[in-house]
């Protein structure tokens, strides 16, 4: 759920990393209400995810590692 560029809530679904091409961090102290990770999928979707959840942190690390290796 997002309003303009801000996530207002989190997805209930767990995304597989193979469908995710990148992510953006949303910070509550930078104009939005909540902290979030916005995953960008191969189908050009933006999905708001809870940065506290294990699967979210795991994928963020996988993607960060890919960027470093490029």
């Amino acid at each position: 759920a997002s309003n303009f560029d801000c996530c207002l809530g989190y997805t209930d679904r767990i995304l597989h990393p193979k469908f995710i091409v990148g992510f953006t961090r949303q910070l509550a102290n930078e104009g939005c209400d909540i902290n979030a990770i916005i995953f960008h999928t191969k189908k050009k979707l933006s999905v708001c995810a809870n940065p506290k959840q294990t699967w979210v942190k795991y994928i963020v690390r996988l993607l960060s590692k890919k960027v470093k290796n490029m």
Epitope: I14, K52, T54, K57, Y58, R61, L62
Partner: antibody, heavy 124, light 107 residues
Framework: EVQLVQSGAEVKKPGSSVKVSCKAS????????ISWVRQAPGQGLEWMGG????????NYAPKFQDRVTLTADESTSTAYMELSSLTSEDTAVYFC?????????????????WGRGTMVTVSS | DIQMTQSPSFLSASVGDRVTITCRAS??????LAWYQQKPGRAPKLLIY???SLQSGVPSRFSGSGSGTDFTLTISSLQPEDFATYYC?????????FGGGTKLEIK
């Protein structure tokens, strides 16, 4: 109750590889992160990496990034840790451990189930 | 990556003593900290998770506190079975990192 059963002790030559297994029984496997932690004789604990079996890809500590490969077989509920280019400094006990909560839960709840450890000795 | 500095490395104490072990993170980790106890030849055992929550089955003489960068593990009245090595672990972010350990010995 979940148990993690690890493979037996190994003696390896320098330059070779070792593959340690960790079989889960009595609970869900695919949606829990499995970590690998090693402990050299008389030393502290060192996190090597982790894998969520359903995701397949492993996350690694930078120190081990180039030498360790974590895999998981969902059909047998078994996780594997392969370490290559062994040296005497890799002589250690290798533990697998499972997160307390599945990957949909909040992180930070610790690893509550541990294997007994696998002793790997690297010697010429 | 987040570094965890644990102190002291060694601690001598007597049965009945109150002891405190500290762990400091190189950056803020909220409350994403766990404490483990390890005895020789055994796997680590989870004592405290989320900085202050007691793992099921762990005696209430163990307690944890702290948030951000500074954390403590307290044993209110040492028992003979508590002499072991204790480790903190941050799981705020990958890679996970352990503190260097505190060996608690009988005085």
């Amino acid at each position: 109750e979940v148990q993690l059963v690890q493979s037996g002790a190994e003696v390896k030559k320098p330059g070779s590889s070792v593959k340690v297994s960790c079989k889960a029984s009595g609970g869900t496997f695919s949606s829990y992160a499995i970590s690998w932690v090693r402990q050299a004789p008389g030393q502290g604990l060192e996190w090597m990496g982790g894998i969520i079996p359903m995701f397949g890809a492993g996350n690694y500590a930078p120190k081990f990034q180039d030498r360790v490969t974590l895999t998981a077989d969902e059909s047998t509920s078994t996780a594997y840790m392969e370490l290559s280019s062994l040296t005497s400094e890799d002589t250690a006990v290798y533990f697998c451990a499972r997160d307390s909560t599945d990957f949909s839960g909040d992180s930070g709840l610790g690893m509550d189930v541990w294997g007994r450890g696998t002793m790997v000795t690297v010697s010429s | 990556d987040i570094q965890m500095t644990q102190s002291p490395s060694f601690l001598s104490a007597s049965v009945g003593d109150r002891v405190t072990i500290t762990c400091r993170a190189s950056q803020g980790i909220n409350n994403y900290l766990a404490w483990y106890q390890q005895k020789p030849g055994r796997a680590p055992k989870l004592l405290i998770y989320a900085a202050s929550s007691l793992q099921s089955g762990v005696p209430s003489r163990f307690s944890g506190s702290g948030s951000g960068t500074d954390f403590t593990l307290t044993i209110s009245s040492l028992q003979p079975e508590d002499f072991a090595t204790y480790y903190c672990l941050q799981d705020s972010d990958y890679p996970l990192t352990f503190g260097g350990g505190t060996k608690l010995e009988i005085k």
